[in-house]
């Protein structure tokens, strides 16, 4: 907390400029008008203020906007955003994707901080759903973003947004999350032809039910082992040896290398030895 002291003669700030970096903390508090700061926030980032000076500027904005900053100020916070607490951010009403991008840019290259997580949460809740443009933006900054959401949160993702999802965005998703995303992806890509459809749906298949895997096995898709290993155990177990052979195509030989690993091991255990022998891989049930 900076003490209230009168501004020395001739030091009253007329604009936000580099001369302010020479002001002591108490001088910034006394000589910079909060309303001026709010209207010239875009200039703050061009000036090499110390962390302590930024604390004073934040304090002035907090006094001016005790109920939370307006979006016109939020959009130009720049590095001052790093000074905000999640409690500060919960007071905001961020509706513009440009504002979101500007603040994410400040945190770029770092792990998702509690501040960023709160900002994203506020933004998405304000929009009511995770639309394609928002998802595009968030996954560009944080490839693991989608997998950080709970299954309940993912249920608000409309199928149209699925087009924005890249395979790497799903790398850390667990089975429960893919259970939610797969039906959306199936709906989003339903009008694509066989081979194009498989390319798009492949990274979501960890949420696919048995009947969809059976259908894919009839389409010469040649699923790779990495994808097969991510399939749901309950979806894999009912597949016959012939269906798995068709599903994997030339990749079926890879089952040997994975025979001790789930879900391959679980599937092998439940097949007739005679059927396994038809693969010629030496798999033991």
């Amino acid at each position: 907390e900076v003490e209230k002291t009168a501004c020395p003669s001739g030091k009253k700030a007329r604009e936000i400029d580099e001369s302010l970096i020479f002001y002591k903390k108490w001088e910034l508090e006394a000589c910079v008008d909060a309303a001026l700061l709010a209207t010239q926030m875009d200039r703050v980032n061009a000036i090499p203020f110390t962390y302590e000076q930024l604390d004073v500027l934040k304090h002035k904005l907090d006094e001016l906007y005790p109920q939370g900053y307006p979006e016109s100020v939020i959009q130009h916070l720049g590095y001052l955003f790093l000074k905000m607490s999640p409690e500060d951010i919960r007071k905001w009403n961020v509706t513009s994707l440009e504002t979101l991008k500007a603040l994410l840019e400040v945190n770029k290259g770092h792990e998702m901080s509690p501040q960023v997580a709160t900002l994203i949460d506020r933004f998405v809740k304000g929009r009511g759903q995770l639309d394609k443009d928002t998802l595009d933006t968030l996954t560009a900054f944080y490839p693991g973003y989608l997998c950080s959401l709970s299954p309940e949160e993912l249920s608000s993702v409309p199928p149209s947004s699925i087009w924005a999802v890249r395979p790497q965005d799903l790398d850390t998703c667990d089975p429960r999350q893919l259970d939610v995303l797969y039906p959306k992806a199936r709906l989003a890509f339903q009008n694509m032809n066989g081979s194009e459809y498989f390319v798009k749906i492949q990274s979501f298949l960890g949420g696919a039910p048995t009947e969809d895997l059976k259908a894919l096995s009839q389409q010469n898709v040649s699923m790779d082992l990495a994808t097969f290993m991510k399939l749901r155990t309950d979806a894999v177990l009912p597949l016959t040896v012939a269906e798995v052979q068709k599903l994997l195509g030339p990749h079926v030989e890879g089952l040997k290398a994975e025979e001790r690993h789930r879900p391959v091991r679980d599937w092998i255990l439940r097949q007739r030895q005679d059927d396994l022998d038809t693969l010629g891989l030496g798999l033991q049930g």
Epitope: D174, P175, R176, M229, K230, T233, D234, L237, R260, H261, R262, R265, D266, L269, R270, Q284, G285
Partner: antibody, heavy 119, light 107 residues
Framework: QVQLQESGPGLVKPSETLSLTCTVS??????????WSWIRQPPGKGLEWIGY???????NYNPSLKSRVTISVDTSKNQFSLKLSSVTAADTAVYYC???????????WGQGTMVTVSS | DIQMTQSPSSLSASVGDRVTITCRAS??????LNWYQQKPGKAPKLLIY???SLQSGVPSRFSGSGSGTDFTLTISSLQPEDFATYYC?????????FGGGTKVEIK
Amino acid sequence: QVQLQESGPGLVKPSETLSLTCTVSGGSVSSYYSTWSWIRQPPGKGLEWIGYIYYSGSTNYNPSLKSRVTISVDTSKNQFSLKLSSVTAADTAVYYCARDNVFTGFDIWGQGTMVTVSS
Amino acid sequence: DIQMTQSPSSLSASVGDRVTITCRASQSISSYLNWYQQKPGKAPKLLIYAASSLQSGVPSRFSGSGSGTDFTLTISSLQPEDFATYYCQQSYDASYTFGGGTKVEIK
């Protein structure tokens, strides 16, 4: 609901064979979704998985014990059994039988039986 | 074999504390990771399966997260009945392995 109960001698002499049986009640050992495991815990130590069996008779053993272990299943009696040969004092432990549900893990355990290896 | 390393091996906490136990696999095990609670003289009890799914009947203060090699068990607000030893276990590889255990004691 499914319950498991271990039975067998509590004292075994060194170099002899330890034999335990697990009786499954309230369910079938022939369950499609379950394998049946033996797990042990030496006094004051952690858990060690010994091996499992499927109702078809397929088995899978801990590599460190494989040469001494045999697990078998008797579907008519709804039981599965453990035999551990050439025991030493290091095999003294509480032995548990457990159901390994393919979707959830070891979701049902017996209460455990203490086996001491001593002359 | 896949080695499972738990940390810490023991911890002291008070009722109401948030407790976090970590488990690291020596190679990727996808989401095939389970957590168990064991009290003295009793058989272990399944708490969390598939890394993050809560077993039926287990209080919601228990949660699990992680995939690949790094996993976490969290107790959001420790209760008197939660003082016990906790084990992680991988079921990805056919040779199942447990972590060494974490004993949660009263501070």
